[in-house]
């Protein structure tokens, strides 16, 4: 409507006792420059006098009359565009409607702005994303509908009462569209943050507490598990029994399924929180864990390495290299499956014990013709002595010896 003055400013401004209020404001008059400006508090139109009644907070007229409130209220505008105002300090009884009475040479206008002044600093508001998942970065937002050039404030983030280490980005807006102070914190919550209290604290320039808002984190996470084993060292002998128990220390939402894995492969028909292994064999040695799932996904416990100990199995001998040339070096390796590893070896050459050879490997620095033959070994560990395997044949190649002519 071309018969109206055009104003732009926030609809309502918020402050508290003793703070200040900065009112960003622009206008366009119907004709000519502004000649008179009066700022009313809760103006009411008097039909009898055809004028507005109310407390005059500020007055700027041709004759220069100025109310005593003038020191507290500043008109920072001009005669044709800017109608920005500042009230510093602002008081509780300033709450209500501010009326901007504007007069040009031929036209008059009353523009109303709402001012909400609280007794104490009002709390900021924490905004969280609709869902928070562990290890996924989220942005926490703390918003306060307040900003004023004459009253610096700060917003601080706390987790369980302790300042958060992550760097927050604070921004302020003092525009005709909005007035606010906002702090944004990028944060990768862990499952252990579930149920923890996050606080956004409003402080003055000196760090003095003014108000706060708190939220409880709801961090969706896969089940967190603890595995317990009896015996606790997970070292048993063949024929012993083993019990593993899976405990859910945390799950959000609640868990739905349970399974057990050995060496990464699921064990069939094992869907309870207890895994009983009776009369274990050495084939059951391996890495065990439990897996519990919820709507977020599967959670796995740490792995338990089950060691089923047994005496050495019949040994085999590997020869590097056969056939060997006389004078070359040869290495023999005794191979025997055992748990724990063998601690002692006995070596045989053509069935006769090789004195002083008690290690897994035997080196012969220079091979001679009489070193040819069958090499075998026996491995020994704390559980017993293995059997001598078939052995390996060393062939020694050598030049002719003691050539005689017939």
């Amino acid at each position: 409507d071309s018969s109206k003055w055009v104003f732009e400013h926030p609809e309502t401004l918020y402050a508290w006792e003793g703070a200040c209020v900065w009112i960003p404001c622009t206008y366009r008059a119907l004709d000519g420059d502004l000649e008179s400006f009066i700022l009313f508090h809760n103006p009411e139109y008097n039909k009898n006098t055809s004028k507005f009644d109310g407390t005059r907070l500020y007055e700027s007229t041709k004759d220069g009359k100025v109310p005593s409130e003038q020191k507290r209220v500043q008109f920072l505008g001009d005669k044709n565009k800017n109608c920005t105002l500042s009230i510093h300090p602002v008081h509780l009884n300033d709450s209500g409607q501010l009326g901007l009475r504007m007069e040009s040479k031929t036209e008059k206008w009353m523009e109303r702005i709402h001012l909400n002044v609280s007794e104490r600093p009002f709390p900021p508001h924490i905004q969280l994303p609709p869902e928070i998942q562990e290890s996924q970065e989220v942005t926490l937002t703390c918003l306060l509908n307040f900003s004023c050039y004459g009253y610096p404030i700060q917003l601080q983030w706390l987790l369980e009462g302790v300042p958060m280490r992550q760097a927050a980005v604070t921004s302020t807006s003092l525009t005709i569209k909005s007035v606010f102070t906002r702090s944004e914190l990028k944060f990768s919550p862990q499952w252990s943050h579930h149920g923890k209290i996050v606080t956004c604290q409003l402080q003055d320039a000196d760090g003095k507490f003014l108000s706060n808002d708190t939220v409880q984190l709801n961090v969706k996470h896969t089940p967190k598990l603890e595995i317990k084993v009896t015996p606790s060292d997970a070292i048993v002998r063949e024929g012993d029994s083993v019990t593993m128990t899976c405990e859910v220390s945390s799950s959000n939402p609640e868990y739905t399924t349970v399974s057990w894995l050995k060496d990464g492969t699921s064990l069939k028909k094992q869907n309870t929180f207890t895994l009983n292994l009776r009369e274990v064999t050495k084939d059951q040695s391996g890495k065990y864990c439990c897996q519990v799932s919820n709507d977020v996904g599967p959670g796995r416990s740490e792995e338990v390495f089950l060691q089923v100990q047994y005496a050495p199995e019949p040994s085999t001998v590997q020869i590097l290299h056969s056939p060997a040339v006389e004078g070359s070096q040869v290495e023999f390796l005794c191979m025997s499956l055992a748990n724990p590893l063998p601690t002692n070896y006995t070596w045989y050459h053509n069935g006769k014990e090789m004195q002083g050879r008690t290690e897994e490997k035997v080196h012969i620095p220079k091979i001679l013709p009489w070193h040819a033959g069958t090499y075998s070994c026996v491995a020994e560990n704390i559980l017993g002595t293995g059997q001598r395997g078939p052995g390996a044949e060393l062939d020694v190649q050598y030049p002719p010896k003691k050539v005689t002519t017939v």
Partner: antibody
Framework: QVTLKESGPGILQPSQTLSLTCSFS??????????VGWIRQPSGKGLEWLAH???????YYNPALKSRLTISKDTSKNQVFLKIANVDTADTATYYC????????????????WGTGTTVTVSA | QAVVTQESALTTSPGETVTLTCRSS?????????ANWVQEKPDHLFTGLIG???NRAPGVPARFSGSLIGDKAALTITGAQTEDEAIYFC?????????FGSGTKVTVLG
């Protein structure tokens, strides 16, 4: 009975080449598992292994002296030779030859029989 | 080049057991060092005792034995006799050369 006997010049001057001979009996260097090595002992000090040679012509040298040493054998004469080039006073020592053998039924070598040594003095 | 270290001197009595050790500056002595032990008696009389860490040379008395103790080679004389008074040298093989130790003087107090 195995015996080894060293022989050398007794005295020689710096920068000359020292030639040593080890004559042995009671074994042959054509027999598998037999070797002869040279070891020296400066007066009042420890032993220093120099080189050894096996029946199959395998030769091994002390890395610190390798450029100056040459070991060789004459199997038919039962002799092993060691040459040390460009001698210095630090080469003054008693030089021993020793049999290094892998006896029948064994898998390792032994410095089993030694000569009584020959004294060499390098002097200007 | 490696340095082979031995005790400079040890004293024992007849019938007692004495152990001599041989350390390598390059780390633990292993069977791949084929430790040899040589005895020197007065008048430069040398005799080989042990080869390949723990094998007695033919004709060497059974009271002499070789072994590995921890990271060192060892020569043990079990039931020392007065004629065992001598200097004992160890020699270690380093893939293509021997290095002798400085020798241990063993005194058998009669």
């Amino acid at each position: 009975q195995v015996t080894l006997k060293e022989s050398g010049p007794g005295i020689l001057q710096p920068s000359q080449t020292l030639s040593l001979t080890c004559s042995f009996s009671g074994f042959s260097l054509s027999t598998s598992g037999m070797g002869v090595g040279w070891i020296r002992q400066p007066s009042g000090k420890g032993l220093e292994w120099l080189a050894h040679i096996w029946w199959d012509d395998d030769e091994y040298y002390n890395p610190a002296l390798k450029s100056r040493l040459t070991i060789s054998k004459d199997t038919s004469k039962n002799q092993v030779f060691l040459k040390i080039a460009n001698v210095d006073t630090a080469d003054t020592a008693t030089y021993y030859c020793a049999r290094i053998s892998i006896p029948y039924g064994y898998y390792d070598w032994f410095f089993d029989v030694w000569g009584t040594g020959t004294t060499v003095t390098v002097s200007a | 080049q490696a340095v082979v270290t031995q005790e400079s001197a040890l004293t024992t009595s007849p019938g007692e057991t004495v152990t001599l050790t041989c350390r390598s500056s390059t780390g633990a002595v292993t069977t791949r060092n084929y430790a040899n032990w040589v005895q020197e008696k007065p008048d430069h009389l040398f005799t080989g005792l042990i080869g390949g860490t723990n094998n007695r040379a033919p004709g060497v008395p059974a009271r002499f034995s070789g072994s590995l103790i921890g990271d060192k080679a060892a020569l043990t004389i079990t039931g020392a006799q007065t004629e065992d008074e001598a200097i004992y040298f160890c020699a270690l093989w380093y893939s293509n050369h021997f290095i002798f130790g400085s020798g241990t003087k063993v005194t058998v107090l009669g």
